[in-house]
């Protein structure tokens, strides 16, 4: 009797219900809401995230522009149809019929319409921009000392390979880290950067969905980053198709 | 896969001292917050102290206060258990344990996500 066997628990997903019933009595794992198996090793989709979300109990500037196709999530929380490798379906749609189409991180990228609503592929979010207000501090914090510690955090906590967060900016108080993943360069088990830019947001707004009670412990040479503001920018691989009246809205 | 490796584990009489280490062999070691868990004979896993990974912070349950210290080095990816006045009922297999990186822990197990195998400690009377 080991003290690993009494964590039968997911790391990386709280929103799980596990058992020791896998093969060998090995701990098994699977996701509110859609009772899907997930790999606790790694992150779990965003799509499954929401799904068991929804589930629950109800409770020289240096800075980047976004591009003018560039995505913000203002839809809010919606109960997401996922796919059997837990992505969301290029199309959802709600209790009242209404669909739209979104891009792989579930952001709606077109105009809402009916069930006849057409959506061919799901779009890849290739580019996404998180940007950040940091709480006041005595000074500003060294930009190479945040650099790395945030390249870290990405590596170690969310186990996003390196090569995709392609840059972080710095002028006090904005931080914007960049992602960059495109279809090509994503291999088989690479963490998803839309999946990473979820973790890291819900951590920011203190509901870390890794095991335990604790939360994001974020400190660049000791000194605490506390964020008070997330902007969280998305660009896809084909632009968004709006019609122009919500864009004169 | 992390590796956590307990030693220092021995008999000792009552009153006397050990020093138990865990060393951390995954790379995510000065990140995570590091704690000490124990198991006597037919009882229920216990927390007995927790650290952050600046070592600034540090976490006793009553029983092992003002007897115990915990202390990391992060060159060494080592997290330390002093263990002073020791007490008959402080026998226990004890376990080191590392949260996931960059999470806040405390003495509640369920904060930490890899587990040593444990070291034995034995006090007699």
């Known amino acids: 009797h080991t003290a690993a066997q009494d964590n039968c628990t997911c790391p990386t997903n709280k929103m799980t219900v596990c058992s020791p019933d896998g093969p060998g009595g090995r701990c098994q794992c699977r996701a509110l809401g859609s009772g899907m198996a997930v790999d606790c090793s790694t992150l779990t989709s965003k799509c499954l995230l929401l799904k068991a979300r929804m589930s629950a109990p109800k409770n020289a500037r240096t800075l980047v522009r976004p591009s003018e196709h560039a995505l913000v999530d203002n839809d809010g929380l919606y109960d997401p149809d996922c796919d059997p490798e837990g992505r969301f379906k290029a199309r959802q749609c709600n209790q009242t019929s209404v669909c739209w189409c979104v891009n792989s991180v579930g952001v709606r990228r077109t105009d809402k319409g009916d069930l006849s609503l057409r959506c061919d592929e799901l779009v890849r979010t290739h580019h996404i921009l998180i940007d950040l207000r940091h709480r006041p501090t005595a000074g500003a914090f060294n930009h190479s000392d945040l650099d790395a510690e945030l390249r870290r955090l990405f590596r170690e906590r969310y186990r996003l390979h390196p090569k995709f967060v392609a840059a972080v900016h710095y002028e006090q108080p904005t931080i914007q880290i960049e992602l960059r993943q495109n279809t090509s360069q994503k291999a088989a088990g690479d963490v998803d950067i839309g999946d990473a830019a979820y973790y890291f947001e819900r951590d920011i707004k203190g509901e870390s969905l890794f095991q335990g009670r604790g939360g994001l412990d974020l400190r660049v040479r000791g000194e605490p980053l506390q964020v008070e503001r997330t902007l969280i920018y998305y660009l896809d691989e084909i632009p968004p198709k709006f019609s122009m009246k919500r864009l004169t809205a | 896969q992390v590796q956590l490796q307990e030693s220092g584990g021995g008999s000792v009489q009552a009153g006397g001292s050990l020093r138990l280490s865990c060393v951390d062999s995954?790379?995510?070691?000065?990140?995570?917050?590091m704690g000490w868990f124990r198991r006597a004979p037919g009882k229920e896993r216990e927390g007995v102290s927790v650290?952050?990974?600046?070592?600034?912070?540090?976490y006793y349950a009553d029983s092992v206060k003002d007897r115990f210290t915990i202390s990391r080095d992060n060159a060494k990816n080592t997290v330390y258990l002093q263990m002073n006045s020791l007490k008959p009922e402080d026998t226990a297999m004890y376990y080191c344990?590392?949260?996931?990186?960059?999470?806040?822990?405390?003495?509640?197990?369920?904060?930490?996500?890899?587990w040593g195998q444990g070291t034995q400690v034995t006090v007699s009377s």
């Open positions: 344990a590392a949260s996931w990186p960059y999470q806040t822990a405390s003495l509640d197990a369920m904060d930490f996500t890899d």
């Open positions: 650290i952050s990974p600046y070592g600034d912070s540090t």
């Open positions: 995954g790379s995510t070691y000065s990140r995570r917050y």
